[in-house]
């Protein structure tokens, strides 16, 4: 990692395993408006590779609610509304950070966890086209 | 939030603003293999709404590196490799949690931050506005 100069105004850490365990302020600074993904855009319905959104809830995790995308079709929707099965609807996945209560049920102790979530779907061709 | 029963084996918190500030173990539990998004799949190239991946680096943030998707075209790529501008390539966005060093440069003190990232692109039918 990058060496960060220690600021004299930093909170002190008594932890032997420092910096494995850190203090985190849960008062979230939001750089954008948080919304239910269904409200944020209607791409899930208008896409040529539309998807359903499944609610995944876990009280031992922060955030406790995560939305998972599942593609509606094997193929992709054409302009006439029919599905072209020679194309594929595929999920776009992303690794995200969540906080997992550890030990379980503890309100003030967490461990960072990486999970893979499907965010939406895209339509792919079995062949790669190089567009000039 | 959901009320979590207090476990007697939980670490104690002396913080007046409890549970605003919590202890987080940075020893990440990875539920999947972490990879560079370019290696994980070639969807960014094979999609009818292909995208480029831009590296966004910030040493004051954890994770310090985030990949941002930018759609390559306004329209969508057809089977013949040409772009159909009657359709739109749009970014699929997701809100993710990151840790922001606070105060700045402090190695063991963070604040949770929500940021909006573009994960990939999908091809959508444009909304037609009917002018009276």
């Amino acid at each position: 990692g990058i060496a960060i100069p220690r600021n004299s105004g930093c909170p002190n850490s008594e932890d032997k395993n420092f910096p494995r365990t850190v203090m985190v302020n849960l008062n979230i600074h939001n750089r954008n408006t948080s919304t239910n993904p269904k409200r944020s855009s209607d791409y899930y319905n208008r896409s040529t590779s539309p998807w359903n959104l499944h609610r995944n809830e876990d009280p031992e995790r922060y955030p406790s609610v995560i939305w998972e995308a599942k593609c509606r079709h094997l193929g992709c929707v054409k302009a006439d509304g029919n599905v072209d099965y020679h194309m594929n609807s595929v999920p776009i996945q992303q690794e995200i950070l969540v906080l997992r209560r550890e030990p379980r049920h503890c309100p003030n102790s967490f461990r960072l966890e990486k999970i893979l979530v499907s965010v939406g779907c895209t339509c792919v061709t079995p062949i790669v086209h190089h567009v000039a | 939030g959901i009320a979590i029963p207090r476990n007697s084996g939980c670490p104690n918190s002396e913080d007046k603003n409890f549970p605003r500030t919590v202890m987080v173990n940075l020893n990440i539990h990875n539920r999947n293999t972490s990879t560079n998004p370019k290696r994980s799949s070639d969807y960014y190239n094979r999609s009818t709404s292909p995208w480029n991946l831009h590296r966004n680096e910030d040493p004051e943030r954890y994770p310090s590196v985030i990949w941002e998707a930018k759609c390559r075209h306004l329209g969508c790529v057809k089977a013949d490799g040409n772009v159909d501008y009657h359709m739109n390539s749009v970014p699929i966005q997701q809100e993710i949690l990151v840790l922001r060093r606070e105060p700045r440069h402090c190695p063991n003190s963070f604040r949770l931050e929500k940021i909006l990232v573009s994960v990939g692109c999908t091809c959508v039918t444009p909304i037609v506005h009917h002018v009276a």
Partner: nanobody, 124 residues
Framework: EVQLVESGGGLVQAGGSQRLSCTAS????????MGWYRQAPGKQRELVAL???????DYADSVKGRFTISRDNAKNTVYLEMNSLKAEDTAVYYC??????????????????WGQGTQVTVSS
């Protein structure tokens, strides 16, 4: 939830035959389409054959006349009869279906589901 379970893969001689089957189970309301895709080493996943709820079928050009897809609606099962097999048919074969089903009290009118895949190896 929905599960697709394949069976019937394995090693076969060139010119020989093989039959794959796949059964869908779970909180299924209806199956719109069922079929098979395949992925050969270093290649992209491609369509092999699909059968629709009305009984019509769609085949990849490379398998037309050699492969036959059929379906038992009562058993939520799809079959792929593969004849005159060639070395280029070697791939992992994935069962796939578009299914309307219930999950957590919500009805999803259509969702794509995939099996784990079964290896078919054609030796020349």
């Amino acid at each position: 939830e929905v599960q697709l379970v394949e069976s019937g893969g394995g090693l076969v001689q060139a010119g020989g035959s093989q039959r794959l089957s796949c059964t869908a189970s779970g909180t299924i309301v209806n199956i719109h389409v069922m079929g098979w895709y395949r992925q050969a080493p270093g290649k992209q996943r491609e369509l092999v054959a699909l059968i629709f709820s009305g009984g019509s079928a769609d085949y990849a050009d490379s398998v037309k006349g050699r492969f036959t897809i059929s379906r038992d609606n009562a058993k939520n099962t799809v079959y792929l009869e593969m004849n005159s097999l060639k070395a280029e048919d070697t791939a992992v074969y994935y069962c796939a279906a578009e299914i309307g089903y219930y999950s957590g009290g919500t009805y999803y009118s259509s969702e794509a589901h995939w099996g784990q895949g079964t290896q078919v190896t054609v030796s020349s």
